[in-house]
Amino acid sequence: AQHVTTQLVLRNKGVYESVKYIQQENFWIGPSSIDLIHLGAKFSPCIRKDQQIEQLVLRERDLERDSGCCVQNDHSGCIQTQRKDCSETLATFVKWQDDTGPPMDKSDLGQKRTSGAVCHQDPRTCEEPASSGAHIWPDDITKWPICTEQAKSNRTGFLHMDCQIKGRPCCISTKGSCEITTREYCEFMHGYFHEEATLCSQVHCLDKVCGLLPFLNPEVPDQFYRLWLS
């Protein structure tokens, strides 16, 4: 059986939309599937790599690599999107390409970044971990770390940094899929909202779905002990 909830929820474009949340009900009137997984049920994607989920994550990453920061022209906010999802008339799509990106580093002026920009994250304004020396962030936003400390400055002059961020990574469903969404939408969908991250590639949704002890390598499920827990 399915339980359907409909509600008006604030979405990425800053408008409220009617959203449906479909929950697979437990036939035996008990915990939901997500709760059962958290409690240690035999759920194979938590025990070993699942090809379907792996392909989903790779597809999400490929899309994210090509994303940019969509900044609303009315200063109402910004969100990481694909170019096609950013209004050409009501917003500005900040995406580095060709020669428009910043240099990889102050020591390497010739090589320009082509991957980015990312809403609220920039190698030039992140103090920790700083992009410098032997630790220059790669020209692939899906390999960027989470910035734990921003440079102390009210404004940077960068469109993608001085905007009010409207969406962050949200882990939705038992498949461990990730979407950049508003907090409201994420909570309504019973997802896990990552306040600390800017990109889906920075979070490991399956690790969150599985719960219990974190994977030794966040990319590789290793909870073999589930075979004995349940």
């Epitope: 990106g101 240099p103 102050k106 020591s107 002026l109 030039r124 410098s132 404004r155 940077t156 960068f158």
Partner: antibody
Amino acid sequence: QVTLKESGPGILQPSQTLSLTCSLSGFSLSTFGRGVGWIRQPSGKGLEWLAHIWWDDEKYYNPALKSRLTISKDTSKNQVFLRIANVDTADTATYYCARIQNYGSNYWYFDVWGTGTTVTVSS
Amino acid sequence: LIVLTQSPAIMSASPGEKVTMTCGATSRISYMFWYQQKPGSSPRVLIYDTSNLASGVPVRFSGSGSGTSYSLTISRVEAEDVATYYCQQWNSYPLTFGAGTKLELK
């Protein structure tokens, strides 16, 4: 208010070492992303970049003069120094220090300049 | 080494006139920076990233260009614009400036 003030010997003789000091106020060179550069200008001529130093102590020099230049900083005193060894009359110029900024820029630029200090090399 | 060549070396204009000065680079660069130096004063930044006006710079100033060819335009010259204008590149080390364009008033 951000200001930079250069100071130097005024006059020195060929083969001596020129020592310049840039005193910063209104900002700190220990702040992430900050940099300070030295630029000189012979009287009636154009600008020539000499060197710059960043908050993380990375230093960059004009290769044409690199063997003679040394840039350094004292974060506690909020000062930047430039030494030019073995000067000669061609080093006679006004020496400016300038703050490096990247506000809104994909690169960097010299956004605040000092008033400059005049140095004459003469025997 | 990227050499920047400014032209003309000297130009004169009447108040209210539109003037354009150019800066050519020996190699392709991504962005150009422009500085103004009034007689007896230190330089100040006018334009960064080719076309962005620095803080406090009047809107009569504008910059454009790409590749190896860049220009600075003053839409209506005023007496206070009498100065030498320098272009500068930050595309590769060493950082280089153009020799300058001196703007005089007729």
